[in-house]
């Protein structure tokens, strides 16, 4: 950055190089150039010469004043006009930053995604600070009193192998930057209560042309958790409101759920699960589309899903299945 240049004098900022956004600040430049009594001192911000609010303090020093400084980052340097010199002489430069102290981290959440081998902790960091902000996640065993600390700039993955202090822990987050420090409330967790089962996936759908046509949704999960509660939500793509069906599931076989739907309408389905009686849900699965036929049977597979609806006996359409849900991160 600009701070790596060779200086012939120095530049400093008051109140500090990193300051609260919206403050009034002063940038001082003091020349120390051999055989030069500066005729004029110039300030540059991001390479552009500043014209106003410059005050000469003495023969070697000048001040640039900014009111209500709102830029997150700026590179400042100053130069001197020396007699008998064609060009301006560089004095020094400095990178300055403005931002905010961190908010109190809240909504601290720790989950173990099945098969991940990690406990993932996240939180709401609050408003953007604009400056480098670090988070220290404290994990304290309620059984051994031992505390571990993890430094991160966002969320943290903690190997479950490193959680040797039993099953019960307190977790809290400290946020710190150059402008301040805040600490979250403590979250008490039990490792057995925060496991989220392996993702549930809708694999295919078919509509059976009986007296009352019936749509069967096939869905599955790789979970080895025995008692799982799931929700499937569905709606016509033209509707705003979801219908929700609840299931107590064990995935010893592929699940089949029956729906009595209106003919010739495109529906969208999603599923999510949680370990029965526990706190956190999976995110909703990818959107799965199925159009009910007018009269003929219809099979829709997750592997195929373009909007190719032909008239004929059985129509199969196939999709990549990579459409994401409208609230993927809903784990609470």
């Amino acid at each position: 950055g600009i701070t790596n240049i060779n200086c012939s004098g120095h530049i400093w900022v008051e109140p500090a190089t990193i300051f609260k956004m919206g403050m009034n600040i002063s940038i001082y430049c003091q020349a120390a150039i051999k055989n030069c009594q500066p005729r004029k001192l110039h300030f540059y911000k991001n390479g552009i010469k500043e014209r106003f609010q410059i005050t000469r303090i003495n023969k070697t020093t000048a001040r640039l004043w900014y009111k209500n400084f709102l830029e997150p980052h700026a590179s400042m340097y100053c130069t001197a006009e020396c007699p008998k010199h064609f060009q301006e002489t560089l004095i020094c430069g400095k990178d300055i930053s403005s931002g905010y102290p961190p908010d109190i981290p809240d909504e601290v959440t720790c989950v173990i995604y099945e098969y991940s081998g990690n406990m993932t902790c996240t939180w709401n960091a609050g408003k953007l600070t604009y400056i480098d902000t670090k988070y220290v996640v404290h994990v304290k065993s309620l059984e051994t009193e031992e505390e571990q600390q993890y430094l991160t700039s966002s969320y943290i993955n903690i190997s479950t192998d490193s959680l040797q202090g039993g099953k019960k822990y307190l977790v809290w987050v400290q946020a710190a930057n150059a402008l301040g420090m805040e600490e979250s409330k403590q979250l008490q967790i039990h490792l057995d209560d925060i496991v989220i089962p392996s993702a549930a996936v809708i694999s295919r759908a078919e509509t059976i042309n009986a007296t009352v046509p019936k749509t069967i949704i096939y869905w599955d999960s790789q979970t080895t958790i025995e008692k799982v509660s799931c929700e499937m939500r569905y709606k016509a793509t033209t509707n705003q409101t979801w219908n929700v069906k609840e299931f107590d599931t064990n995935f010893t076989y592929v699940q089949q759920s029956e729906f009595y739907l209106e003919p010739n309408i495109k529906y969208v389905f999603q599923v999510r699960c949680q370990e029965t009686g526990k706190r956190y849900w999976q995110p909703w699965s990818s959107l799965f589309f199925h159009k009910t036929p007018e009269t003929v049977p219809q099979v829709t597979s997750k592997a195929f899903q373009h909007d190719t609806w032909n008239s004929g006996l059985t129509v199969a359409s196939i999709s990549t299945g990579h459409l994401t849900s409208d609230n993927r991160g809903d784990i609470g």
Partner: nanobody
Framework: EVPLVESGGGLVQSGGSLRLSCAAS????????MAWYRQAPGKQRDFVAA???????NYADSVKGRFSISRDNAKNTVYLQMNSLKPEDMGVYYC??????????WGQGTQVTVSS
Amino acid sequence: EVPLVESGGGLVQSGGSLRLSCAASGSFDSDTVMAWYRQAPGKQRDFVAAVTGTGGTNYADSVKGRFSISRDNAKNTVYLQMNSLKPEDMGVYYCYMRILGGGRYWGQGTQVTVSS
């Protein structure tokens, strides 16, 4: 049906080690979970360990740190390395294969006996 063939069971002293293998006659991919369950006499079949096609693993609390599950996709085989065996680890160990959106398959089982 995809048969699963377990091997590697036997008699071992307390504190000893065994390595179980389970070979599937069909290939398996990232949508397949392979697992081991065990059944002690007069008890229900309990989950021991599982491994996904992408290498994610899961263990029962009672075996964490002692048992290790792995799979070799090229050989269509899953392994269970069992160290520091205890008498309570004794039972018939069953291999289990689950294909996402597809079949579930059990092996015939292999006996593990731990003598104190």
